[in-house]
């Protein structure tokens, strides 16, 4: 249904192969990426409440797809500047994280309930209480399956899991 206004291949914004996104815009995409859909000639990326598309062969498109596949984008994305200002990103940190079962959480309410019920005291990173938990507008078609919200995904709870103790050059703070 490429070209369809309501279909999963509808694009709110097309990015030309001649002018790839800036570093800042890529960081924004990484942070807010929720899903992607492979169309015939391009890939549609679903963000909070809008979409952006790029050619299937464009390097930035491949990078974003890989990023979501590996769960390094979207809700699992912490971001060096925006969300982790208390970290020193100058060298690979030696840190330790609380580990627990982070199931495919469906709603912010369930996410909160999960947090409260957790025996491992997961904590929220600085800045994570943002609008990231918004859902897309009802009239936007996404590839999300029934029963899943945009907050759901592999290791969606990972950005709730913060280190239990400080180690190395990057002392982490946690807010309960």
């Amino acid at each position: 249904n490429e070209g369809s206004v309501t279909g999963s291949c509808y694009c709110g914004k097309r990015i030309s192969s001649d002018s790839p996104p800036s570093v800042q815009f890529m960081n924004r995409l990484r942070k807010h990426l929720r899903a992607y859909h492979r169309c015939l000639y391009y890939t549609r990326f679903q963000l909070l409440s809008w979409s952006v598309c790029g050619g299937n062969k464009d390097p930035w498109v491949q990078e974003l797809m890989s990023c979501l596949d590996l769960k390094e984008c979207g809700h699992a994305y912490s971001g060096i500047v925006a969300h982790q200002k208390h970290l020193l990103p100058t060298s690979p940190p030696i840190s330790q994280a609380s580990e627990g079962a982070s199931s495919d959480i469906h709603t912010p309410a369930q996410m909160l309930l999960s947090t409260l019920q957790s025996t491992q005291r997961p904590t929220l990173p600085v800045g994570s209480l943002s609008s990231d938990k918004e859902l897309t507008r009802p009239n936007e078609t996404t590839i999300h399956t029934a029963g899943h919200s945009l907050a759901a995904g592999p290791e969606a709870g990972e950005n709730q899991k913060q280190p239990e103790k400080n180690a190395g050059p990057t002392a982490r703070t946690s807010a309960t």
């Epitope: 890989s66 840190s95 580990e99 982070s102 495919d104 592999p154």
Partner: antibody, heavy 118, light 113 residues
Framework: EVQLVESGGGLVKPGGSLRLSCAAS????????MNWVRQAPGKGLEWVAR??????????FYADSVKGRFTFSRDDSKNTLYLQMNSLKTEDTAVYYC?????????WGQGTTVTVSS | DIVMTQSPDSLAVSAGETVTINCKSS????????????LAWYQQKPGQSPKLLIY???TRQSGVPDRFSGSGSGTDFTLTISSVQAEDVAVYYC?????????FGGGTKVEIK
């Protein structure tokens, strides 16, 4: 060709330390999510630790059984992983594999053997 | 943690027969963000490291013979070895990488009669 080569294994007494290394080549190391998995003699596979990529501050995650004793780090400039293992226990005896998770699959090294015995 | 239940524990078949190994996860491994199932299948021969056969539940790794195939979605997955050969004698593991910690099935030992 993707290659992961572990080193640093050996025999150590309980309470001792070892540092494992894993040299990677053949793929974009900085984009890969790296893990350590171990296999005790005659047993199944057990995940040990994970380290994320630079955009996620190289965040690390550990199995409960090693938390507080093992430290996972990576050096993207050298395409190398490190697993510092302290306060080793006899139950840590296993073959340790480093793995690279990419969109093209999950690659494994040949493993390095760690034996903890008095 | 996601529990991976693999069956059978072992099986013995004649060369040329078809082998089916099942793997069930305690929660769905299908990610709505990309419609991919985060499940892999490995083959491990004695004294060797695990060899990736299948990833994303059904994508065959480069160099793996086409007699190996993976199927399934959500919580139920299958590895099929059609026309088993002598070199296929090994232990086969399923693994989920949907969530940390990664978890593995208990393994299925395949032998030739």
């Amino acid at each position: 060709e993707v290659q992961l080569v572990e080193s640093g294994g050996g025999l150590v007494k309980p309470g001792g330390s070892l540092r494992l290394s894993c040299a990677a080549s053949g793929f974009t190391f900085s984009n890969a999510v790296m893990n350590w998995v171990r296999q005790a003699p005659g047993k199944g596979l057990e995940w040990v630790a994970r380290i994320r990529t630079k955009p996620n501050n190289y965040a690390t995650f550990y199995a409960d059984s090693v938390k507080g004793r093992f430290t996972f780090s990576r050096d993207d400039s050298k395409n190398t992983l490190y697993l510092q293992m302290n306060s080793l226990k006899t139950e840590d005896t296993a073959v340790y594999y480093c793995t690279a998770w990419t969109t093209e699959g999950i690659y494994w090294g040949q493993g390095t053997t760690v034996t903890v015995s008095s | 943690d996601i529990v991976m239940t693999q069956s059978p524990d072992s099986l013995a078949v004649s060369a040329g027969e078809t082998v089916t190994i099942n793997c069930k996860s305690s929660q769905s491994l299908l990610y709505s963000g990309n419609q991919k199932n985060y499940l892999a299948w490995y083959q491990q021969k004695p004294g060797q490291s695990p060899k990736l056969l299948i990833y994303w539940a059904s994508t065959r790794q480069s160099g793996v013979p086409d007699r190996f195939s993976g199927s399934g979605s959500g919580t139920d997955f299958t590895l099929t070895i059609s026309s088993v050969q002598a070199e296929d004698v090994a232990v086969y593991y399923c693994q989920q990488y949907y969530d940390t910690p990664w978890t593995f099935g208990g393994g299925t030992k395949v032998e030739i009669k």
